[in-house]
Amino acid sequence: KSPIFGPEEVNSVEGNSVSITCYYPPTSVNRHTRKYWCRQGARGGCITLISSEGYVSSKYAGRANLTNFPENGTFVVNIAQLSQDDSGRYKCGLGINSRGLSFDVSLEVSQGPGLLNDTKVYTVDLGRTVTINCPFKTENAQKRKSLYKQIGLYPVLVIDSSGYVNPNYTGRIRLDIQGTGQLLFSVVINQLRLSDAGQYLCQAGDDSNSNKKNADLQVLKPEPELVYEDLRGSVTFHCALGPEVANVAKFLCRQSSGENCDVVVNTLGKRAPAFEGRILLNPQDKDGSFSVVITGLRKEDAGRYLCGAHSDGQLQEGSPIQAWQLFVNEESTIPRSPTVVKGVAGGSVAVLCPYNRKESKSIKYWCLWEGAQNGRCPLLVDSEGWVKAQYEGRLSLLEEPGNGTFTVILNQLTSRDAGFYWCLTNGDTLWRTTVEIKIIEGEPNLKVPGNVTAVLGETLKVPCHFPCKFSSYEKYWCKWNNTGCQALPSQDEGPSKAFVNCDENSRLVSLTLNLVTRADEGWYWCGVKQGHFYGETAAVYVAVEERKAAGSRDVSLAKADAAPDEKVLDSGFREIENKAIQDPRLFAEEKAVADTRDQADGSRASVDSGSSEEQGGSSR
């Protein structure tokens, strides 16, 4: 007995589409083997019409597709524009057509019902508008016009020309009588409901000479489009509901129990808490179409989504809708990365951003998610050397470690930096990921002067104190610019005396600038790293002024440190704070990471990899 399962019989009518789901045991081999749909011939062979390896028969060109859903152990064959020639016996299967891993499906396509019994068939999508046309003869031009709906055995009046409207249709139906030249009246029903479907009879006149016309109204619940995305990746729902609802509030909702559809986001400003920080509703076009992007996909995001238009901003009977069934593939190609990164005021964070390694040349971006209105994500930095002005000197996007990951370092943290940030590229849009930065209590690990002034032509030495916890890390100084942070020579000056309870493994590493020039003015970072993985950083702004007295300058912590939250007004720059960065190696291990942040009282930082537990920033 074949383990493949599907519908034994599918009945449809000409012009329609069918969507045939075939189920298979989701073993590793089955998931990856060829899937096919073939038509059985009279002599027992089975001619392939479409397969998962890209083959499409000329008979199916432009009207069929086959989609595999390995996570579910299903594949779906969609066939459009059916004709009676498509009637026959088919197989859906795995592997080679003749090997028996298949299921027999009988497809029967009959003539459309619109061709039968003088009944005009109207097939309209849920929430849309239908116009039922009713012809009549001259002798009935002045007589009552009416539309009935067949309920069981009895016709029930829906609307008539005397002004009656059935309560089920109030506010969404009208009867139009054309000008005297046209012997036609029409009934327009808006915001169609599933319950509107059925047999209608329109009539002109009430006696035996009345004119009658039958109509069959089919209201289509939209078949959900199947969407298959990777865990931790992103999905975009494109919603085009038509210009007639261009000025009506739009929504995306997720079906839960029964008929309920919980609003995920709408244009009235509502957003479900579960999607905070990872959803954007893109502004709609003039034609009323819009799109919703969700990043950081979770297993529980899977389900049926509807987009629609209604003044309430939520699903109501008669809302025009589009539907999707979202599957979230847990065998994701997108690597795990922390969903929460913690740092302290005055400290720093280093965020690892995954991207599709096939697109190493793509431009990388980092943006800050803003929840106002429908959500937006203004860019802060890119890999082409652009940094938003307010972030100069404290934000850098590095291509390292490469091979599918880039790093973003943000230092001089303040409480205002808490929030959600998105990693993205101009390549594969499915690789958008989200990270939340949280500011926690604590002190920065690295200690540097708060502000430094150098004298033209003299030598400047700037200290950076590294606690013993970083004894095994590479320590560096670099000069920040828009494209990164260029490494500079530095000197290890032995153990630091800046730390209580810290042994000989603490270090004081100094940056020396000889014969200072105007070009030396700018931001300097000291930091730690292991290979291409960056840890904490701290930043110092070096101002350059004219010579006042001879000699070299040695800057100490005591003389130059800025107080917590103090604005360094004399240098004309924003407050200068200590910073430190999380060590990405630790991200990968999903362990707590030592990290410092924005307050001058500083603290350590740690990261979370998607679990609801947040790890503390204990030192290691």
Partner: nanobody, 128 residues
């Protein structure tokens, strides 16, 4: 509240036929799929048949392995009734037959977990 009510069960001789009905009621019922399952004494509930329709005259019919052309699932003209026509009945078809409906989109129609509404069942006894 949605209610599913099965009827048409009873005692029949081997080789005979029965037609089971499943009537749905309730203001919120708008399912476009109904399944039949059966449960013999001391056994697990077993998939019998499933029908899924869309408003554009397309209908999909699924059957359990053991059916082998003996049973036919269909939808009544009232649109809220589904039938299971059972022919060539065998003693091993003796069971309580249940109809079930999902709230929304369905995955594998053979899985009881996919269905949200269940009837109370109707007993079919096939004597030899």
């Amino acid at each position: 509240e949605v209610q599913l009510v099965e009827s048409g069960g009873g005692l029949v001789q081997a080789g005979g036929s029965l037609r089971l009905s499943c009537a749905a009621s309730g203001r919120t019922f708008s399912s476009d799929a109904v399944g039949w399952f059966r449960q013999a004494p001391g056994k697990e509930r077993e998939f019998v048949a499933h029908i899924h329709w869309s408003g554009d005259f397309t209908t999909y019919y699924y059957y359990g392995d053991f059916v082998k052309g003996r049973f036919t699932i269909s939808r009544g003209t009232a649109k809220n009734t589904v039938y299971l026509q059972m022919n060539s009945l065998k003693p091993e078809d003796t069971a309580v037959y249940y109809c079930a409906a999902p709230k929304g989109a369905i995955g594998d129609p053979r899985s009881t977990r996919e269905y949200d509404y269940w009837g109370q069942g109707t007993l079919v006894t096939v004597s030899s």
